[in-house]
């Protein structure tokens, strides 16, 4: 039975040209995290494997930095970075947990963080 929940940074906004940290946190389970995948829509951004560490897709290595923790830092943001991001936690024995973050990249300097929310 999957008892865990994923807490994410929720709906967030950031300025064009700036950076943002995408964070997810798995709680309420004792399951072992074996791998965390980060996706933007259907594209793989990065993998953090418990044994091997980080793998950053060559398509994004200019603008994506691993961490902090199991999170991901996006740099040199453009308006095209606006959209859904997913953290996919592979765990044993529970299975897979998925968290969703929506990022809006703004042209203006008014870019405020949204509230945190939970996805069961």
């Amino acid at each position: 039975m999957m008892t865990g929940t994923i807490e994410t940074t929720g709906n967030i906004s950031a300025e064009k040209g700036g950076s943002i940290i995408l964070q997810c946190h798995l709680s309420s389970t004792t399951a072992q995290v074996t791998q965390v995948n980060w996706e933007q829509q259907d594209q793989l951004l990065a993998i953090c494997n418990a044994d091997l560490g980080w793998h950053i897709s060559p398509s994004f290595k200019d603008r994506v930095a691993p961490g902090p923790g199991l999170g991901l830092t996006l740099q040199s943001l453009t308006v095209n970075d606006t959209g859904e991001y997913f953290c996919i936690y592979h765990t044993y024995p529970d299975g897979t947990y998925t968290g969703r973050i929506f990022l809006e990249v703004l042209e203006s300097s008014v870019a405020e963080h949204g509230a945190r929310f939970q996805i069961p």
């Epitope: 791998q35 995948n37 793989l44 993998i47 091997l52 060559p58 290595k61 200019d62 996919i88």
Partner: antibody
Framework: QVQLQQSGAELVRPGTSVKMSCKAA????????IGWVKQRPGHGLEWIGD????????NYDEKFKGKATLTADTSSRTAYMQLSSLTSEDSAIYHC??????????????WGAGTTVTVSS | DIVMSQSPSSLPVSVGEKVTMSCKSS????????????LAWYQQKPGQSPKLLIY???TRESGVPDRLTGSGSGTDFTLTISSVKAEDLAVYYC?????????FGGGTKLEIK
């Protein structure tokens, strides 16, 4: 040690499809990318794409999108490549390779012996 | 796509001779964040699969003799064999793994004069 065992040679008709296999041994199959490389006499080596069995992620060279489909079966530790709508241009040796992970990703330290595909009517 | 160009396409040599072959890329393979060149060299003998010789432009794969040396940075790379042995006769390919799609050079064939 790491080994990649490929399926045998194929003689196929134009317009049909072929599916070849690459069975991995000696490492954790889900942890490393598996790539595919085409080799034709006079054309050198061409990277087709790769797959990450630990998530099913794939990358393709644009010129092989619609031609090649990469899949992996974690239970049998086997990667597959299907080639469709075959023509004489698809006659080649197809190698599977260990594509690495993270800081070892992108260069190929282990190669399969290759599967020879001959397209002929 | 990054285009990889190798020269010469054929390289006649004598055993014991020092040889160099060139590989040029249409874009820099040096990644500023880690200061690494994303370039590999392979050797392919007749009837065999290619074998990795060099990665990160200059790091020898385990078991590769030190008479083979990779050098260069950015867009210009060189593979040097300090004293050719008969067993070195093969085709040598360079490959970039900096950006998708990964691409290979056309190869340099090392052959006896």
């Amino acid at each position: 040690q790491v080994q990649l065992q490929q399926s045998g040679a194929e003689l196929v008709r134009p317009g049909t499809s072929v599916k070849m296999s690459c069975k991995a041994a000696g490492y954790t199959f889900t942890n490393y990318w598996i790539g595919w490389v085409k080799q034709r006499p006079g054309h050198g080596l061409e990277w087709i794409g790769d797959i990450y069995p630990g998530g099913g992620y794939t990358n393709y060279d644009e010129k092989f999108k619609g031609k090649a489909t990469l899949t992996a079966d974690t239970s049998s530790r086997t990667a597959y490549m299907q080639l469709s709508s075959l023509t004489s241009e698809d006659s080649a040796i197809y190698h599977c390779v260990n594509g690495g992970y993270g800081s070892t990703y992108g260069y190929f330290d282990v190669w399969g012996a290759g599967t020879t595909v001959t397209v002929s009517s | 796509d990054i285009v990889m160009s190798q020269s010469p396409s054929s390289l006649p040599v004598s055993v014991g001779e020092k040889v160099t072959m060139s590989c040029k890329s249409s874009q820099s393979l040096l990644f500023s964040s880690d200061q690494k060149n994303y370039l590999a060299w392979y050797q392919q003998k007749p009837g065999q699969s290619p074998k990795l010789l060099i990665y990160w432009a200059s790091t020898r794969e385990s078991g590769v003799p030190d008479r083979l040396t990779g050098s260069g940075s950015g867009t210009d790379f060189t593979l040097t064999i300090s004293s050719v042995k008969a067993e070195d006769l093969a085709v040598y390919y360079c490959q970039q793994y900096h950006k998708y799609p990964f691409t290979f050079g056309g190869g340099t064939k090392l052959e006896i004069k």
